[in-house]
């Protein structure tokens, strides 16, 4: 009798649908070749295929096998009109699985999926399943046609991890799932507002996002011209306001507020606000005569363009006299005063049209 081939090896490539059959040659000399058959088992519907190859070959390939169907593969040694007993094995070509599933357009309530539809006529569609973190049973399932390569899962909850699987479907079978995990975005706060603005403080308020129990809010702030100098405050999720203190006067700040859920931050809600000018300080008087004196002060910290100095007798209801000096000066001599009179002097720092609070002092001639 003819000796059959040995060491039959079957390998199906799910991406190409090609079945490679390989074997070790028969020990019978001068054979004609090998006959290879692939037949669906148990009378399942599908193509029965056959190849005959030359004696010096030890492999062959079959296309167009139906994924998910079990096939019996047999290889016979052939010599003229005689055949050996076959060497046989079975294989179920895998249903091709998606390899390029990715996430796009992630929001706090939806996750977009994208993939390249597989090029196989046997695929009838895809099933999408969504499992929430810590749960067993899927919370969502849907089907799409075989030509579809995009799907948006909606109605999700913010800040939750989801295992999302896409499964290739064929008639009577399915692929292994392609599964990725993605977290929905944490929703940001809204309606950023600034109130109670002073030279070194400001009150920041915001509206918390609905329908999520946050861990906290993160407030970050820094001068616009020095954004590396960032200060950060963690605010209780039950609060929606904070007073920023120890700020630089006359300085524009960028302020951002983010929602935090567990370790995940929302996109920041950003705004800009300038602190007020601080007042000059340390008013003092010198060179006092019957009709003049000199006023001195210490410059404020803020960048300014100059000062406005007004003076009038203490119990005078008319219009005060006004002088302006550049920012480089910190004194002025007031003249043409009335002897023996108490004067009220006020100094305001100016930056363009912006004014500081008043610095006020009194002095008699």
């Amino acid at each position: 009798p003819l000796s059959p081939p040995t060491n039959l090896h079957l390998e199906a490539n799910p991406d190409t649908g090609v079945l490679t059959v390989s074997w070790e040659r028969s020990t019978t000399p001068d054979i004609t070749g090998y006959r290879i058959t692939t037949t669906p088992t148990n009378g399942q519907q599908g193509n029965s295929l056959e190849e005959v190859v030359h004696a010096d070959q030890s492999s062959c390939t079959f296309d167009n096998l139906s994924p998910g169907l079990e096939y019996n593969v047999s290889v016979y040694t052939v010599k003229d009109d005689k055949e050996s007993v076959p060497i046989s094995d079975t294989i179920i070509p895998e249903v091709p699985q998606l390899t390029d599933l990715s996430f796009v357009d992630i929001t706090d309530s939806s996750i977009g999926l994208r993939w390249t539809p597989l090029n196989s006529s046997t695929i009838i569609g895809y099933r999408i399943t969504v499992v929430a973190a810590g749960e067993g049973i899927p919370i969502f399932e849907d089907f799409v046609d075989s030509s579809v390569g995009y799907y948006t899962v909606t109605g999700l909850e913010p800040g939750i991890d989801y295992d999302i699987s896409v499964i290739t479907l064929i008639n009577g079978g399915e692929s292994a799932p392609t599964t990725l995990t993605q977290q929905t975005a944490v929703p940001p706060p809204t309606d950023l507002r600034f109130t109670n603005i002073g030279p070194d403080t400001m009150r920041v308020t915001w509206a918390p996002p609905p329908s999520i129990d946050l861990t906290n809010f993160l407030v970050r702030y820094s001068p616009v011209k020095n954004e590396e100098d960032v200060a950060e405050l963690s605010i209780s999720p039950s609060d929606n306001a904070v007073v920023l203190t120890n700020l630089l006067p006359g300085t524009e700040y960028v302020v951002s507020v983010s929602s935090v859920y567990e370790q995940h931050e929302s996109t920041p809600l950003r705004g800009r606000q300038k602190t007020g000018l601080d007042s000059p300080t340390g008013i003092d008087f010198s060179d006092i005569t019957a009709n003049s004196f000199t006023v001195h002060w210490i410059a404020p910290r803020a960048t300014i363009t100059g000062y406005r100095i007004r003076h009038h007798p203490e119990h005078f209801s008319g219009r005060p006299r006004e002088d302006r000096v550049p920012h480089s000066r910190n004194s002025i001599t007031l003249t043409n005063l009335t002897p023996g009179t108490e004067y009220v002097v006020s100094i305001v720092a100016l930056n363009g049209r912006e004014e500081s609070p008043l610095l006020i002092g009194q002095q008699s001639t």
Partner: antibody, heavy 117, light 108 residues
Framework: EVQLLESGGGLVQPGGSLRLSCAAS????????MSWVRQAPGKGLEWVSR????????YYADSVKGRFTISRDNSKNTLYLQMNSLRAEDTAVYYC??????????WGQGTLVTVSS | EIVLTQSPGTLSLSPGERATLSCRAS???????LAWYQQKPGQAPRLLIY???NLATGIPDRFSGSGSGTDFTLTISRLEPEDFAVYYC?????????FGQGTKVEIK
């Protein structure tokens, strides 16, 4: 038209076993997860078990875990529930339902299981 | 597990009246995962509403659902004779899926 038809219910003694079947038609059975839901006489609905479309994943209510086994034969479009170590509190109408998470979109008419000595 | 509490237990109304059924969850459930079913004596439950407010195929528009978080409502605007039945809410967000204990709508 989607149809689900349960069978296999009946009277069984406590500690006994029973196997329920659910024949499905009118849809691609192998593409859908299926569940069993039960209803004790005069009571509300209670989910019992679920099986994934391929049969690779199964889930059970705590009340039946270790005693009931859900399975399916996609070539026969049939869902099964093997119930062992039955107790009086398992007495109920058992419905099979197509479980398109998060809801049960089609239900069978149910089969009554009575556990009594 | 999530406990769904339905109220009232029984609602006695006449045909043509409006029925309002409540379902309260023991913890927040996204509206995407809440459904309502109708069950008549001797019959299987039938899906009425999914995603809290979407009508299932073939369900008349006198049925409507609303709610979010922990409080959901099923409303029947004008009761027809065939609407007298038991109604169940169900959540599918958390494992295991759970049902409310039901509200019976009976003829007054």
């Amino acid at each position: 038209e989607v149809q689900l038809l349960e069978s296999g219910g009946g009277l069984v003694q406590p500690g006994g076993s029973l196997r329920l079947s659910c024949a499905a038609s009118g849809f691609t059975f192998s593409s859908y997860a299926m569940s069993w839901v039960r209803q004790a006489p005069g009571k509300g609905l209670e989910w019992v078990s679920r099986i994934s479309p391929s049969g690779s994943s199964t889930y059970y209510a705590d009340s039946v875990k270790g005693r009931f086994t859900i399975s399916r034969d996609n070539s026969k479009n049939t869902l099964y529930l093997q119930m062992n170590s039955l107790r009086a509190e398992d007495t109920a109408v058992y419905y099979c339902a197509r479980h398109t998470a998060p809801l049960f979109d089609y239900w069978g008419q149910g089969t009554l299981v009575t556990v009594s000595s | 597990e999530i406990v769904l509490t339905q109220s009232p237990g029984t609602l006695s109304l006449s045909p043509g009246e409006r029925a309002t059924l409540s379902c309260r969850a023991s913890q927040s459930v996204s509206s995407s995962y809440l459904a309502w079913y109708q069950q008549k004596p001797g019959q299987a439950p039938r899906l009425l509403i999914y995603k809290a407010s979407n009508l299932a195929t073939g369900i008349p528009d006198r049925f409507s659902g609303s709610g979010s978080g922990t409080d959901f409502t099923l409303t029947i605007s004008r009761l027809e004779p065939e609407d007298f039945a038991v109604y169940y809410c169900q959540q599918g967000r958390h494992t295991p899926p759970t049902f409310g204990q039901g509200t019976k709508v009976e003829i007054k």
